[in-house]
């Protein structure tokens, strides 16, 4: 089973069914359909999946049977286009069905919605969930796949199978426990948080491929895998990068069966050749397939070889740099990136890519100059400010985080980003700033050598969320510019933005600052989101408000909520005290 297997199969659908097995086949088709038709009811998707599965079985029995030679896109697209309510539910997406493959699939991909208008998932009582799990385990787990896939249309499908396996294990264990809730709820919280993080990481991979092309993704992969596998040869890293690129291209393109199959092959290859790749893979390679693939993807960096020579001799001091570069530009730059990355597990991937880009730009300029060697001799000096910028930023922000704690650090970022891009919707600013703020608890605890790769690569994932949400309804030229100009310079671009002086403050609307007793029954997290939403709105009304003014208003607001939630007549308290608070805030901010 090599990379070009499909040529040998008369029926692609039969081939994938046999490779993956019925259970994974059905799960992946369900994920694919739910990621395309995000508004369709669960029962409709199950029906479509069952029809596809029955058809696949006929092809397994006889690969020459009618329609079995059709591509998966043709088969799945034809099936999706049988949905009766396509025009009413999806509007112009129905026009995709008039197209032929491959344009039809491209059309479906373009209509994936990163922020679908779907109700928030509310977690039922534990007993209710356990009853549903025991009554029909298969339906219960399919529902999980469906609900996650439709809300996260770029979720990495083979990884979602791993999440579903853990979800099932949690219910199997906890629904028999003495204290079901104490057992189950922390596991579900962990799966939810990990799932959101996994979705966001994959969304960046797909954006990288779709917006910046295969070369950009491959460069990212060379840098990351060279850090992770510093003992591996460049050709080994290159082979892994090629295969990984194929896997992610397939998943991001909606080819989930091929993606899952190729990911399994890649895990198999890595484990068969771990001696040439990394000493850290042993435990991963003893696990079953889904756990194995997940484990490999998260494996810690191997130790750096002890005797790595200086790079300056061959990449700067040598007179042959331009000759070598001219002979095979991408191989030479790939080697430079590999050599630099394996020596620097302490750098973020995006920093390594900035250094490689600087090196490439210098060679392009200098190799055409009269004295190339003289021209590129100082190229490594140009790296210093590029390295120091994220180092200083992380130092400052970790100090601020340690001083303020997560909630107040998020608030500082909310104010900072609302002033930078006040046109962005309040829910997006709250979501993105809250996630940016989580960098503190996630990364500042690490020693210096691990802070930058943790922080800056995490920030790249979060800022990509801003970029994909903003792309759906663009409102800020500054956001568009930072998102589209350079993938690796997104974070520095946003960091460099100052207060938007062109912004006309939002009209004051008392309704925005009217609160009710329902806030008292919210979880701490939901209450924080309410307060942070108010903070963004305040800044939109008064972008020139000082930190002190905003802090005073927010402190008053927190006291107001605490007071009214303790009152006997909460609703009356919120109505009366709320009016006073609005008036006092207006006065304090000069509104």
């Amino acid at each position: 089973r090599g990379v070009f297997r499909r040529d040998a199969h008369k029926s692609e659908v039969a081939h994938r069914f046999k490779d993956l097995g019925e259970e994974n086949f059905k799960a992946l088709v369900l994920i694919a359909f739910a990621q395309y038709l995000q508004q369709c009811p669960f029962e409709d998707h199950v029906k479509l999946v069952n029809e596809v599965t029955e058809f696949a079985k006929t092809c397994v029995a006889d690969e020459s049977a009618e329609n079995c030679d059709k591509s998966l896109h043709t088969l799945f697209g034809d099936k999706l286009c049988t949905v009766a309510t396509l025009r009413e539910t999806y509007g112009e997406m129905a026009d995709c069905c008039a197209k032929q493959e491959p344009e039809r699939n491209e059309c479906f991909l373009q209509h994936k919605d990163d922020n679908p208008n779907l109700p928030r998932l509310v977690r039922p009582e534990v007993d209710v969930m356990c009853t549903a799990f025991h009554d029909n385990e298969e339906t219960f787990l399919k529902k999980y796949l469906y609900e996650i896939a439709r809300r996260h249309p770029y979720f990495y499908a083979p990884e979602l199978l791993f999440f579903a396996k853990r979800y099932k294990a949690a219910f199997t264990e906890c629904c028999q426990a003495a204290d079901k809730a104490a057992c189950l709820l922390p596991k579900l919280d962990e799966l939810r948080d990990e799932g959101k993080a996994s979705s966001a990481k994959q969304r960046l991979k797909c954006a990288s491929l779709q917006k910046f092309g295969e070369r950009a993704f491959k460069a990212w992969a060379v840098a990351r895998l060279s850090q992770r596998f510093p003992k591996a040869e460049f050709a080994e890293v290159s082979k892994l990068v090629t295969d990984l690129t194929k896997v992610h291209t397939e998943c991001c393109h909606g080819d989930l069966l091929e993606c899952a199959d190729d990911r399994a092959d890649l895990a198999k290859y890595i484990c068969e050749n771990q001696d040439s790749i990394s000493s850290k893979l042993k435990e991963c390679c003893e696990k079953p397939l889904l756990e194995k693939s997940h484990c490999i993807a998260e494996v810690e960096n191997d130790e750096m070889p002890a005797d790595l020579p200086s790079l300056a001799a061959d990449f700067v001091e040598s007179k042959d740099v331009c000759k070598n570069y001219a002979e095979a530009k991408d191989v030479f730059l790939g080697m430079f990136l590999y050599e630099y990355a394996r020596r620097h597990p302490d750098y973020s991937v995006v920093l390594l890519l900035r250094l490689a880009k600087t090196y490439e730009t210098t060679l392009e300029k200098c190799c055409a100059a009269a004295d190339p060697h003289e021209c590129y001799a100082k190229v490594f000096d140009e790296f210093k400010p590029l390295v120091e910028e994220p180092q200083n930023l992380i130092k400052q922000n970790c100090e601020l985080f340690e001083q303020l704690g997560e909630y107040k650090f998020q608030n500082a970022l909310l104010v900072r980003y609302t002033k930078k891009v006040p046109q962005v919707s309040t829910p997006t600013l709250v979501e993105v700033s809250r996630n940016l703020g989580k960098v503190g608890s996630k990364c500042c605890k690490h020693p210096e050598a691990k802070r930058m790769p943790c922080a800056e690569d995490y920030l790249s994932v979060v800022l990509n969320q801003l970029c994909v949400l903003h792309e759906k309804t663009p409102v800020s030229d500054r956001v568009t510019k930072c998102c589209t100009e350079s993938l690796v310079n997104r974070r520095p671009c946003f960091s460099a933005l100052e207060v938007d002086e062109t912004y006309v403050p939002k009209e004051f609307n008392a309704e925005t600052f009217t609160f009710h007793a329902d806030i008292c029954t919210l979880s701490e997290k939901e209450r924080q989101i309410k307060k942070q939403t108010a903070l963004v709105e305040l800044v939109k009304h008064k972008p020139k408000a000082t930190k002190e003014q905003l802090k005073a208003v927010m402190d008053d607001f927190a006291a107001f909520v605490e007071k009214c939630c303790k009152a006997d007549d909460k609703e009356t308290c919120f109505a009366e005290e709320g009016k006073k608070l609005v008036a006092a805030s207006q006065a304090a901010l000069g509104l």
Epitope: S276, D320, K323, E327, A328, E339
Partner: nanobody, 125 residues
Framework: HVQLVESGGGSVQAGGSLRVSCVAS????????MGWFRQAPGKEREGVAS????????FYTNSVKGRFTISRDNAKNTVYLQMNSLQPEDTAMYYC??????????????????WGQGTQVTVSS
């Protein structure tokens, strides 16, 4: 066209040392991955050590780590293999090979494009 010429082989007692050399002519960046392979009678050819002549990174098969050292002198277009603490099982014909750094893998001789004629190393107990 790349030409590789090995020298320095010979016979030595167990525990002794030898240094073999490989001079490359017509070498380019796309043949800047240089390796040493060996083949004992009746056995498959196996990778011993490799070096990127641009970058200088080195790789070794497990059985020679700590005993053998590969190095280069780019000015002389020469790659060396210093072999210390030689054992009888190191007896083999030693071949120099060159290939593209994007393709060459020490565990796979087919990923190297150019080969020398070989030099015999014999270690007696």
């Amino acid at each position: 066209h790349v030409q590789l010429v090995e020298s320095g082989g010979g016979s030595v007692q167990a525990g002794g040392s030898l240094r073999v050399s490989c001079v490359a002519s017509g070498n380019t960046y796309l043949t800047s991955c240089m390796g040493w392979f060996r083949q004992a009678p009746g056995k498959e050819r196996e990778g011993v050590a490799s070096i990127y002549t641009v970058g200088g990174s080195t790789f070794y098969t497990n059985s020679v780590k700590g005993r053998f050292t590969i190095s280069r002198d780019n000015a002389k277009n020469t790659v060396y293999l210093q072999m210390n603490s030689l054992q009888p099982e190191d007896t083999a014909m030693y071949y120099c090979a060159a290939g593209s750094p994007a393709r060459c893998r020490l565990r796979d001789p087919t990923t190297f494009d150019y080969w020398g004629q070989g030099t015999q190393v014999t270690v007696s107990s």
